[in-house]
Amino acid sequence: SDKLYQRKEPVISSVHTKVKGIAEVTENVTEGGVTKLGHSIFDTADYTFPLQGNSFFVMTNYVKSEGQVQTLCPEYPRRGAQCSSDRRCKKGWMDPQSKGIQTGRCVPYDKTRKTCEVSAWCPTEEEKEAPRPALLRSAENFTVLIKNNIHFPGHNYTTRNILPTMNGSCTFHKTWDPQCSIFRLGDIFQEAGENFTEVAVQGGIMGIEIYWDCNLDSWSHHCRPRYSFRRLDDKNMDESFVPGYNFRYAKYYKENNVEKRTLIKAFGIRFDILVFGTGGKF
Amino acid sequence: SDKLYQRKEPVISSVHTKVKGIAEVTENVTEGGVTKLGHSIFDTADYTFPLQGNSFFVMTNYVKSEGQVQTLCPEYPRRGAQCSSDRRCKKGWMDPQSKGIQTGRCVPYDKTRKTCEVSAWCPTEEEKEAPRPALLRSAENFTVLIKNNIHFPGHNYTTRNILPTMNGSCTFHKTWDPQCSIFRLGDIFQEAGENFTEVAVQGGIMGIEIYWDCNLDSWSHHCRPRYSFRRLDDKNMDESFVPGYNFRYAKYYKENNVEKRTLIKAFGIRFDILVFGTGGKF
Amino acid sequence: SDKLYQRKEPVISSVHTKVKGIAEVTENVTEGGVTKLGHSIFDTADYTFPLQGNSFFVMTNYVKSEGQVQTLCPEYPRRGAQCSSDRRCKKGWMDPQSKGIQTGRCVPYDKTRKTCEVSAWCPTEEEKEAPRPALLRSAENFTVLIKNNIHFPGHNYTTRNILPTMNGSCTFHKTWDPQCSIFRLGDIFQEAGENFTEVAVQGGIMGIEIYWDCNLDSWSHHCRPRYSFRRLDDKNMDESFVPGYNFRYAKYYKENNVEKRTLIKAFGIRFDILVFGTGGKF
């Protein structure tokens, strides 16, 4: 609450996060033309990346394009990309939607469709829907430990969200344990009024707000965090503005002296930890 | 504008960026002693990295040191690094400019020059100039979509830079489309009075400032972003302070049971999105 | 100092860091059942990662789990994880401390101990102590160059911490060279009253605070940074809250058509650069 006689100072903050959990993923795997059900285990090294303190990312879904090589091939026949003759294909043209540079030739993509040939990582990425339900939907049960160190330099005051008295096997709950800083990902979504299973398909951005309203006067000292949660990406966003949250990354390797890559389109939740508040002192 | 009767509050912000574009790179490739012209395609997975929201990086140039192995070899004969006898080489010494630890021996680097032998990733990186023009100079035509969600918690007000009425095929223009949040990288540089082609060689840091000056009073409500651009690295910087923007990363692999790496010195533009402003309410 | 007649504005900041240094690492390496002393060189591409401006990470220690494959194996017999019969193992159960999903069978881990079988990356990671002393303890002698560009948009004022008059071979010292922006990592720890050698074992978080107290009035203009250092992680933290600073990442590869990975648990120092301050003008 506003105490007008106090000198207010904004918080200086540092955050450290630690995600825990394992996901079992079942998906169709094609090898040598044969498709069978594959099971795999994903642990933190597989689904998260060494990110900065104020953000962490949990992969909840993915689409893989394996064994890509730099060569010429027909581009993917997405809407409006088909051709019937070379006239439709412009040598040197880079369509922002496409994944390569056109050679000027119209070539067969499959039995029925022809598309412009491109110089690209081939075969080009298929524009297929993200798997539904999400492959790592069980990430809902992962937990994240959030450590937050704050400082009011003008008041020479430092504290942190984890106190020595806290129990490391707690789980945050708005009513029963509002000071616990271990959060179940599914609970974060529930608190924000969002459906984890749904968001996990396309990905999204979730804000974890940590509000410090600190009274640093000795006679009525109070300085503890208050946690709240809100979705930061626009779930009603138009297709053209890229809804959800995803990015592409590649694993490069050599096979028979040929440079290849596996392209992964990773969908997931980026959690942004937004720390704010003030310290006031007479 | 300052309304002194209003209660002002700083903005809490979250940013999400999405880069689009393909570059065709032509460079000399040496294989088995034969040098020929190589063409390759770079897409987002090749030239950008999964970074946090407030920053994104676009590689515009690079120097590769392929097939490095941990062993002994002569260090690169940069200025002042040559020797004529072992006396000039100090066992265990690590010159900050060097890439290894000296063994104490002065050995031939080539026909005419001798340098201190080092324990290092060999052959050591050649200190050659960044290619000019930059290999991915066509990155000038890449575009970036910037999504910005802002919050004034004290006023319980949230909004974003992308409105439902916006057109996903727009391109930002200061006069004709100042609310479009899709930016052509070359335009950003032009607005900042900088030459993309020049900066792309050594790399640099570009600031995209998003200023929210929000009047949240219902009778004169206004809350839209204003974009501006300025170069953040010092183009006149002394050599000793590492001008431009680059970093080294490695791709590790095994060949004939020998651990090897390809070292990439990546030059590029780091774009920092700096969101600031206040929300005022009576 | 507070000048009440001035209009104050918070700083908008961008940071760029560059770490320099080489470490020689000596460790026991086991190959083909034979253990011998291995020496290796780590340079910036090996011990640091391309991170955002406000944070950089230096790996000071690590534990490797090489040649992991997705299959079934006994889990690591940490405290409380041993079993004597299948009744103790619950099919489908994921213990947050474990690295896999239980199959329901109790199987031999070694001659004397049995643990629950798991579907996981096998063999599962051994929960061994971080090496002491830290493998890259010589990182104490690494240096970091910090470039900081600041802006007070309301006052239309921009400056940076590195001035044209500065000497690129300086090293920061609180008394002798307080404006030099090249810092020896060991000195940062010493200034913060911490022991680098000790922290390097488990890792930690170190804050580098850059305080700009700028008087922008022409008649008494002053705008230079003041550097200070403080440890941000809690060194007295309970085991259950994961003391220190570490993260796991993996290097994936194929061997005889089998997907494998090397898991690296990287301990190190995350340096957070916390820039704050105000610009005041009449």
Partner: nanobody
């Protein structure tokens, strides 16, 4: 282009010995030997850094072959003993920047091991 001249190849019985020599026109940090058997790729055999430090051998020849260098004469030798029929190949001398990295190769000398 560096001209490397090999000598010492020939026909030898299994279990026998042979010594290959190679001269380089100028000093170089590392010198080594490669071989190529009919229908196979060229493979590394042995390498030596300046003054014989370090040395490196392929697993298949360890304990049987010894590489030695004379820096003053810019020469390298390969003493081969305990030869096997599978050692039959054209042997190439090479020079380079480390015992793992070679840039220049000679014309080769034939070694045939009969059973």
């Amino acid at each position: 282009e560096v001209q490397l001249v090999e000598s010492g190849g020939g026909l030898v019985q299994a279990g026998g010995s042979l010594r290959l020599s190679c001269a380089a026109p100028e000093r170089t940090y590392s010198m080594g030997w490669f071989r190529q058997a009919p229908g196979k790729e060229r493979e590394f055999v042995a390498g030596s850094g300046w003054d014989g430090i370090p040395t490196r051998y392929a697993d298949s020849v360890k304990g049987r072959f010894t590489i030695s260098r004379d820096n003053a004469k810019n020469t390298v030798s390969l003493q081969m003993s305990g030869l096997k029929p599978e050692d039959t190949a054209i042997y190439y001398c090479a020079t380079g920047t480390s015992v793992y990295h070679y840039q220049y190769w000679g014309q080769g000398t034939q070694v045939t091991v009969s059973s």
